[in-house]
Interface confidence: low
């Protein structure tokens, strides 16, 4: 067979679907690899071909599109399962070709079982809600294209195992679930079950997502440096170990990158010759506020090191702060017999 541009196995798009539910899977070629869409390809005389490799097998096989009730079908660039079975798990390939052109990509499809409380090995998307922020909504995800707009499905929402009805601050509104005032107690897994008819059959779509209640932007502040501060002086003798913690509190900010770093005499530790190590630890509050600690350590400090400027810097999308540590050389304690005695007028 002639050469084909093979994009390999696209593990970035590990598709998981529930057993015994409809699934529509778009050929990733048009979304991620090629510069044109299916309509353009089709009108240019290119044909889309599907085949698959079963789980734990090496043999590529054509997909059987002649199953009872058209259980597996193809429509434009979409592969349909109505519904899926557990043994549909495998690597699926879509290939676009004509006599002079060929391009293909494979992707893994995993059919997953769920229990009666919607627990499963499915990787769940996380939706973050701001704490005490007013009305916020989540929407039942990935249900577009399963039924025409003329079909009115029924949607039932669950928190964990429990159907959501008469909840204090959570109200189902069709495809949306509204949180009147999000609280920490609203953390958890929420499931929408969409039921719709098609050709005399009834199908269910189950979609679960994790809700995480996080700090509100109303309360967000620039980074706060707790240490170093003006109350602590790092007083050392040459030869001792110098340890200075930089502890910074960051409010939760959606999509913000929090940064903490030290400078020594205005330079990054990597840019200077002294033997310095920096260890970082990170902890989070229940609302995902973050505390970062970077400990600057010089094993055997010299008198030169004790004259340097040690500055902790912190930055988030809210702003930037910096604080210099107070470092000084310890004055040796006087030896009583000589210095103090002299002070008392002894000769």
């Amino acid at each position: 067979s002639e050469r084909c541009d093979d994009w390999g196995l696209d593990t970035m798009r590990q598709i998981q679907v529930f057993e015994d539910e409809p699934a529509r899977i778009k050929c990733p070629l048009f979304e991620h690899f090629l510069k044109f869409n299916y309509s353009t390809a089709h009108s240019a005389g290119l044909t889309l071909i599907w085949y698959w490799t079963r789980q734990d097998r090496d043999l590529e096989e054509p997909i059987n599109f002649r199953l009872p009730e058209n259980r597996i079908s193809k429509e434009k660039d979409v592969l349909w399962f109505r519904p899926t079975l557990l043994n549909d798990t495998g690597n699926y390939t879509c290939m676009l070709r004509n006599t002079t052109y060929c391009s293909k990509v494979a992707f893994p499809l995993e059919v997953v079982q769920k229990d009666s409380c919607f627990n499963s090995p499915m990787k769940l998307p996380v939706h973050k809600l701001y704490i005490e922020y007013g009305i916020q909504r989540i929407t039942c995800p990935n249900v577009d294209g399963y039924f025409p707009s003329s079909v009115k499905p029924t949607i039932t929402w669950y928190m964990g195992c429990y159907k959501i009805q008469n909840f204090n601050n959570v109200i189902p509104e069709g495809m949306n679930l509204s949180f009147l005032i999000a609280l920490i107690s609203n953390n958890g897994n929420y499931t929408c079950v969409v039921t719709y008819p098609e050709n005399g059959r009834t199908f269910h779509l189950t979609r679960t997502l994790t809700v995480k209640v996080v700090g509100s932007p109303k309360n967000a502040v620039p980074p706060v440096i707790h240490s170093p501060n003006d109350h602590v002086v790092y007083e050392k003798e040459p030869g001792e170990e110098l340890l200075i913690p930089c502890t910074v509190y960051f409010s939760f900010l959606m999509d913000s990158r929090n940064e903490v770093w030290w400078t020594i005499d205005g330079k990054k530790p990597d840019d200077i010759t002294i033997d310095v190590t920096i260890n970082e630890s990170i902890s989070h509050s229940r609302t995902e506020d973050e505390t970062r600690t970077q400990i600057l350590s010089i094993k055997k400090v010299t008198s030169e090191d004790l004259k340097r400027s040690y500055v902790c810097h912190a930055r988030s999308a809210k702003g930037e702060v910096a604080k210099a540590a107070k470092v000084k050389q310890k004055v040796p304690a006087p030896r009583y017999t000589v210095e103090l005695a002299c002070g008392f007028g002894a000769t």
């Epitope: 620039p222 999509d255 913000s256 990158r257 940064e259 770093w261 990054k268 400027s309 500055v311 810097h313 930055r315 999308a317 809210k318 702003g319 930037e320 702060v321 910096a322 604080k323 210099a324």
Partner: antibody, heavy 119, light 113 residues
Framework: SLEESGGDLVKPGASLTLTCTAS?????????MCWVRQAPGKGLEWIAC????????IYYATWAKGRFTISKASSTTVTLQMASLTVADTATYFC?????????????WGQGTLVTVSS | AQVLTQTPSPVSAAVGGTVTISCQAS????????LSWYQQKPGQPPRLLIY???TLASGVPSRFKGSGSGTQFTLTISGVQSDDAATYYC?????????????FGGGTEVVVK
Amino acid sequence: SLEESGGDLVKPGASLTLTCTASGISFSSSDFMCWVRQAPGKGLEWIACIYAGSSVSIYYATWAKGRFTISKASSTTVTLQMASLTVADTATYFCARSTGSVGRGFNLWGQGTLVTVSS
Amino acid sequence: AQVLTQTPSPVSAAVGGTVTISCQASQSVYNSNHLSWYQQKPGQPPRLLIYSASTLASGVPSRFKGSGSGTQFTLTISGVQSDDAATYYCQGEFSCVSADCIAFGGGTEVVVK
């Protein structure tokens, strides 16, 4: 507005201090005050920034470290000290401000001051 | 050091036409969106057009549009006017932890015919 001053014709090896003065405004604690230069007929080149809220937050372009020093002289003045000048430092030097949250770009620029290094 | 590569230069456009300038960063800008666009005319300082990759600066006409994230950004000028003839620069803000915080692209000259 921002106004740069101190530009001059100097010989290679000389030092020079440029001053950026704000009129009608004073630098707020969330302002980044920066120096950017532009050689004749060339593009913009970042030199250094100082975070007005904390005079220890100072950033330099790698090439500028050691020869250039940015400092905040007052609530309305930022300076750039330049040492060991070479012909390659000939440029218009702009003072620029980025205000508010980080990532807002430089929304206020001075007209620039010309530094010419020539023997 | 961070590098911002602008293409193409120069670019020529007819009045009423559309100009697209791209800016590619050697590594992701801070928070994926800390990229600004400037317009500069001869003898003048730069003027901020776009910040945070896509937010229009105050007083800038809506025919200027910024898009992109991470390392790939675009400035689009639609309905080009003769007054848009200038050099356009992208400017990225990067993590200050590892390297230079700020870098400018090399500039793209826009000629309006």
